[in-house]
């Protein structure tokens, strides 16, 4: 069964910077990746970025840079302009549209006790949805 993993990292050098890493574990090729925050895409979440393997990326503030890391994983750098660091308590969700399997989504957040530079383990969290 395909799975999606999500990691959220706080950058050690810049406490206002976060990076979301997402990956797809399964067969098929990725046709689209959607990253959202505050909940799953289309279910209360707000889009941060959409990545297409050939056409490029679309991203919205506070996303700073969305990019492919491998053919089945992406990273999204976020710039937190607020002093209160709202990202620390935010859920980030990644939805992978895989051809021809369908869509798979998983969500994750920064662990409550995270020190700068530490990240959530690269394992799927319970919010996993297949369309």
């Amino acid at each position: 069964t395909p799975e999606v993993w999500v990691q959220v990292q706080m950058e050690a050098t810049e406490l206002s910077s976060f990076t979301v890493h997402c990956g797809f574990l399964g067969p098929g090729s990725i046709s689209l990746v959607t990253v959202s925050w505050g909940g799953p895409d289309g279910a209360g979440g707000t889009k941060l970025a959409v990545l297409h393997p050939e056409l490029g990326t679309r991203q919205w503030a506070p996303a700073r840079q969305a990019r492919w890391e491998t053919q089945s994983s992406i990273s999204l750098a976020l710039e937190d302009s607020g002093a209160s660091s709202p990202f620390a308590n935010t859920t980030f969700c990644c939805k992978f549209a895989s051809f021809p399997e369908g869509s798979w989504e998983s969500c994750g957040s920064l662990p409550p006790s995270s020190d700068p530079g530490l990240s959530a383990p690269p394992t799927p969290v319970p919010i996993l949805r297949a369309d």
Epitope: S29, S31, T34, V50, E54, L55, R58, W60, F99, P100
Partner: antibody, heavy 118, light 107 residues
Framework: QVQLVQSGAEVKKPGASVKVSCQAS????????IYWVRQAPGQGLEWMGW????????NYAQKFQGRVTMTRDTSISTAYIELSRLRSDDTAVYYC???????????WGQGTTVTVSS | DIQMTQSPSSLSASVGDRVTITCRAS??????LGWYQQKPGKAPKRLIY???SLQSGVPSRFSGSGSGTEFTLTISSLQPEDFATYYC?????????FGGGTKVEIK
């Protein structure tokens, strides 16, 4: 409601330039790319390129490289396409359309007829 | 560039008929395909995106299927307002390319 309103018809002579505008309303202009598509009389649809209204970045179809310029003015939520060195075969209806995050165009302008004739 | 070959280029049908239009891509495009309807003097209107997802507000008699290189638009029961020209569009790589169109006329 979400809409794109384009400027009026233009008649130009060969060798001249034309600039068509596309004003967006009902949504945040900088959140969606704008595509430009044209259609010659009795012919099919032809994609010309896009502009990112947020950054001003562009991507033009190879066929139009060097002759086309896409710009935007975020203060008035308007995108523009300028085509230079016009030829008679540039006579067409020019459409702007909103890109739906790689899923094609979900909202279209009404079209602007550009006629190139001596 | 990816070529999109649409067939037939025109067809005559009656109200209530089932109509099928096909689009073939010159190389695999996964499900990166949309279908558009255009009436004379009007801008195109999106019917289907991602090969099989129905655009909000579009009647359920329209459906899309296919993946890779072969795609189909089906109108299950043709209505008077469906007489128009239909285009497929590949959204897999730049430049985006349209099929040549299929004109659906009244028999």
């Amino acid at each position: 409601q979400v809409q794109l309103v384009q400027s009026g018809a233009e008649v130009k002579k060969p060798g001249a330039s034309v600039k068509v505008s596309c004003q967006a309303s009902g949504y945040t202009f900088t959140d969606y790319y704008i595509y430009w598509v044209r259609q010659a009389p009795g012919q099919g649809l032809e994609w010309m390129g896009w502009i990112n209204p947020n950054s001003g970045g562009t991507n033009y179809a190879q066929k139009f490289q060097g002759r086309v310029t896409m710009t935007r003015d975020t203060s008035i939520s308007t995108a523009y396409i300028e085509l230079s060195r016009l030829r008679s075969d540039d006579t067409a209806v020019y459409y702007c359309a909103r890109e739906d995050n790689f899923n094609g165009m979900d909202v279209w302008g009404q079209g602007t007829t550009v006629t190139v004739s001596s | 560039d990816i070529q999109m070959t649409q067939s037939p280029s025109s067809l005559s049908a009656s109200v209530g008929d089932r109509v099928t239009i096909t689009c073939r891509a010159s190389q695999g495009i996964r499900n990166d395909l949309g279908w558009y309807q255009q009436k004379p003097g009007k801008a195109p209107k999106r019917l289907i995106y991602a090969a099989s997802s129905l655009q909000s507000g579009v009647p359920s008699r329209f459906s899309g299927s296919g993946s890779g290189t072969e795609f189909t638009l089906t109108i299950s029961s043709l209505q008077p307002e469906d007489f128009a020209t239909y285009y497929c569009l590949q959204l897999n790589s730049y430049p985006l390319t349209f099929g040549g169109g299929t004109k659906v006329e009244i028999k």
